[in-house]
């Protein structure tokens, strides 16, 4: 349990300590005070470094200090022959006792005492980014006027995240641009545009003046714009670096300006608008596009009609065209539906003819009705020959889509009819 | 079929046998069969058989049978209370509408019908074929096919003939354009039984093919010259007749 | 006279084959397409495939695509259905039918029956 | 696929009566392709009517077909005895499959 004070001595003390020991003390105040120890009496072996006995105080990883001989007061009005303050509220002191003792030396008393640190002077690092305040047992920070200070209790930026931009054509800067930037910030903001535009973001060169990054090339201060998955940055650097028109593919951009303690400059100043989603002008072989553009965007609707010979299977329904939307993923609707031969399937039997069987039924295919020779002939006309048409039909030259008729071959005896003489 | 020859059904494919009453027909579709107005005038529902030579019974059973849907008299052929004292053959033509289709094949084939054109009209002398199951020199009807090979003959020469066992006055027999005459040579004729069958002659236009000029309708004497109904004159009805009564799977 | 005598029926357990075998005569087998049509007890008419006049061509119903095959051998005036991986709903009595003009099937088999149940 | 629905299900007549079968089409059909089959109980179908008007071979003319596109009739002026049976209505698309109506039953009254 941490304690404000207390008092630490050799074994047997103030008898002479005894050989080969030891000890050790773990010392421990509250959180926000540090520890004033202080020697009132230390006779200990002498020896280089320490070597033979020694009390050490260590701090953490640090040895603060390491006795050993015999000391006295140098002021008269007071008691203390060596004294160690540390900033933090642990320490440890360990004393040690060789195998051997030439005299007989009484060892050491030490008390320790919880003092108050000053948080905002003591420490190399500043614990606040602007206004420490110091109180006994802690600190708090404080910010100049239009800052905040962050959950982290110690960091101060300026309000500057939070917006969400809905309108489909915008304007976003730094904070106080062009006047320097806040240090220490960070700047959340949403673009949020209806489903169907994508974020489109314009800069002008001259409109982008934020701390360059390091010798690493790492971004000091950085802009970061994030579209779903995709990142663009961190731009850093006098005169915008990445391309002067961001098309983010995405209706929703979060811009991010990170800013370290140091090194602020004018900032930037962006435009944004809302582009219509674009639709690949995707390869739909034998089949044509209707209105015909270079560019397809959200909410475009076009009709894509099958060539001559070719149509659309939907489940078992065939059809010549189909209708197909840009949607607001920048995907066409329907993009499934292909247009492929039209097929006629097995050709229609006729009564006394036949039809020797396709090497395929799809669009272009030729089949030949024959009747029954030499017992029937066709009667129709158009030499039987049919080719799979666009419209799914098996269709004649002079016929159209009628079938041959095979009919019978009149006045034709099989053998002629001869007279037996008598 | 009087001083004819042998013959098969391959060499007559159209003929029609009609075994009540014994008589002939010419089938000139799938569906259709011409034959004399007498022969279907007492039997409105013949039995019909075609692509049999022998008409025996047990041959009978193997070849195609034939079934009526509807019979056809011409409306100029006159019909009698007394059909054996018939004097009066004039239009004696008459079409049988079938069930069903009649598959064609080298023994049932159909006889082409006379053209309008006047290449169809008949000149004395032309040859016709005749065929038939009916009275021979040797019984009264033939078991096979019988044919015969006669010329046309001037109407008169049937007129001159003495009707054997005369029904009536032969005055009161009745010769009219829609008859053809032929026979008498070598006393070549058709007779009792062979009624019906076609009179057929080469097509004058396509010498491969044989149409129907006549049909055997009656005769003075059989083995003098016979009398046929002269089928040219009736294409119009017989096209009528089948458009009217056909299905559109024949149209 | 045209004829159509179906064949191979019986009973058969879920997942079993059976062929059936429809036998032409009175016309040319060989000049018409032909189908297999089926009919559950106390059903209604089913097609179940066809098969086009030379044998090249075939078209079958979803639900037995990759089970059934049609076939036929014009030289035996013969048409076929190999059934395979049987299931209880393909119970029924299996007519083969010629296709006519129009596609239209003008002669029917008397049928045969198939029974699948374990 | 075109799914032909057949109406009524069953129709109770009595003979002399004309009775009216409808048989309709999800999309529109060729009438060249729309056929009628006749039915009774323990027998293969017959071809009735082919190709929405033509009657089969042996089929008496009290008994015609009409319709187009999606509605299809079979219609017969004066029933008689031998009619009473179950009539079935087919349509061939070439992209398959084809199908048949799932019959209306004509029962005596």
């Known amino acids: 349990e941490p304690t404000m004070y207390g008092e630490i001595l050799s074994p047997n003390y103030p008898q002479a300590y005894p050989s080969e020991v030891e000890k050790s003390w773990d010392i421990e105040v509250p959180e926000g005070y540090g520890i004033h120890l202080y020697f009132t009496h230390l006779d200990i072996e002498l020896s280089e470094n320490c070597a033979y006995d020694s009390v050490q105080i260590i701090s953490g990883d640090t040895e603060e200090g390491r006795l050993c001989g015999q000391r006295s007061s140098n002021n008269p009005h007071s008691p203390i022959v060596e004294e160690f303050q540390v900033p933090y509220n642990k320490l440890q002191v360990i004393f040690k006792s060789d195998f051997s003792n030439e005299e007989r030396f009484t060892g050491f008393a030490a008390y320790y005492v919880a003092t108050d640190i000053n948080e905002c002077t003591d420490f190399v690092d500043v614990p606040c980014s602007h206004f420490c305040n110091n109180f006994i047992g802690g600190y708090f920070c404080s910010c100049p006027p239009e800052y905040f200070l962050h959950d982290d209790m110690k960091n101060c930026g300026v309000n500057c995240s939070g917006d969400v931009f809905t309108a489909l054509i915008g304007e976003i800067a730094s904070p106080n641009y062009p006047k320097p930037y806040p240090e220490n910030s960070r700047c959340e903001y949403q673009i949020r545009l209806e489903k169907g535009f994508q974020v489109v973001v314009t800069l002008r060169r001259e409109d982008f003046d934020v701390e360059a990054a390091d010798s690493a090339g790492n971004c000091l201060d950085s802009l970061v714009f994030v579209a779903g998955d995709r990142q663009f940055g961190p731009y850093c650097g006098h005169g915008f670096p990445g391309p002067l028109n961001i098309e983010t593919k995405s209706n929703a951009l979060d811009i991010i300006f990170q800013t370290d303690l140091t090194g602020q400059k004018k900032g930037w100043k962006l435009r944004y608008h809302g582009d219509p989603m674009p639709c690949p002008k995707e390869d739909t072989p034998n089949s044509v596009w209707e209105p015909a553009k270079a560019k397809y965007v959200f909410r475009d609707v076009v009709q894509i009609t099958c060539l001559d010979g070719f149509e659309v299977v939907e489940g078992r329904v065939g059809a010549t065209s189909f209708y197909s939307t840009c949607q607001s993923n920048g995907k066409w609707s329907n993009s499934k539906l292909k247009c492929q031969p039209v097929d006629c399937g097995i050709p229609e039997s006729i009564e006394n003819g036949k039809v020797e069987d396709p090497e395929s039924t799809l669009f272009g295919s030729v089949i030949r009705y024959t009747c029954e020779e030499p017992y029937y002939y066709m009667e129709n006309g158009g030499g039987g020959e049919y080719h799979c048409a666009g419209n799914g039909s098996w269709v004649n030259e002079v016929l159209g889509p009628e079938l041959p008729k095979c009919v019978p071959v009149c006045g034709v005896p099989r053998e002629p009819f001869e007279e037996k003489q008598r | 079929i009087i001083g004819g020859s042998d013959a098969d059904i391959k060499n007559f494919p159209w003929q029609v046998f009609f075994d009540n009453p014994w008589a002939g027909g010419a089938l000139i579709n799938e569906y259709w069969v011409l034959t004399a107005a007498h022969v279907v005038e007492g039997n409105r529902e013949p039995t019909m058989y075609v692509g049999s030579t022998s008409v025996q019974t047990s041959r009978l059973a193997k070849s195609k049978m034939l079934t009526p849907e509807h019979v056809f008299i011409h409306p100029g052929w006159k019909l009698l209370e007394v059909p054996e004292g018939r004097t009066n053959f004039d239009n004696d033509i008459a079409l049988v509408r079938l069930k069903d289709p009649v598959k064609m094949g080298p023994t049932v084939s159909p006889i082409c019908l006379p053209g309008t054109s006047s290449d169809y009209n008949l000149m004395d002398g032309d040859l016709g074929l005749i065929s038939g199951w009916g009275r021979t020199e040797k019984r009264d009807r033939a078991v096979r096919l019988k044919a015969a090979r006669l010329p046309v003959a001037p109407l008169r020469k049937c007129k001159e003939v003495k009707v054997e066992k005369p029904t009536a006055d032969a005055e009161a027999y009745v010769f009219t354009p829609n008859m053809i005459c032929a026979g008498g040579e070598k006393g070549m004729d058709s007779c009792k039984g062979d009624s019906g069958g076609a009179f057929a002659v080469q097509d004058p236009n396509d010498k491969t093919k044989f149409y129907a000029a006549g049909l055997v309708s009656w005769g003075p004497q059989c083995g003098t010259y016979g009398l046929y109904t002269r089928v040219k004159n009736y294409v119009d009805w017989i096209m009528k007749t089948m458009q009217e009564n056909s299905t559109p799977r024949e149209d | 006279e045209v004829m159509l005598v179906e064949s191979g029926g019986g009973l058969v357990k879920p997942g079993g084959s059976l062929r059936l075998s429809c036998a032409a005569s009175g016309f040319t087998f060989s000049n018409y397409a032909m189908s297999w049509v089926r009919q559950a007890p106390g059903k209604g008419l089913e097609w179940v495939a066809t098969i086009s006049s030379g044998g090249s061509h075939t078209y079958y119903l979803d639900s037995v695509k990759g089970r059934f095959t049609i076939s036929r051998d014009n030289s035996k005036d013969t048409l076929y259905l190999q059934m395979n991986s049987l299931r209880a709903e393909d119970t029924a009595l299996y007519y083969c039918a010629r296709l006519f003009t129009g596609y239209a099937m003008d002669y029917w088999g008397q049928g045969t029956l198939v029974t699948v149940s374990s | 696929q075109i799914v032909l629905t057949q109406s009524p299900a069953t129709l109770s007549l009595s003979p002399g009566e004309r009775a009216t079968l409808s048989c309709t089409a999800s999309?529109?059909?060729?009438?060249?392709?729309l056929h009628w089959y006749q039915q009774k109980p323990g027998k293969a179908p017959k071809l009735w009517i082919y190709?929405?008007?033509n009657l089969a071979s042996g089929v008496p003319s009290r008994f015609s077909g009409s319709g187009s596109g999606t509605d299809y009739t079979l219609t017969i002026s004066s029933l008689q005895p031998e009619d009473f049976a179950t009539y079935y209505c087919?349509?061939?698309?070439?992209?398959?499959?084809?199908?048949f109506g799932q019959g209306t039953k004509l029962e005596i009254k």
């Open positions: 999309s529109s059909v060729s009438s060249s392709y």
């Open positions: 190709s929405t008007s």
């Open positions: 087919h349509q061939y698309y070439r992209l398959h499959p084809i199908t």
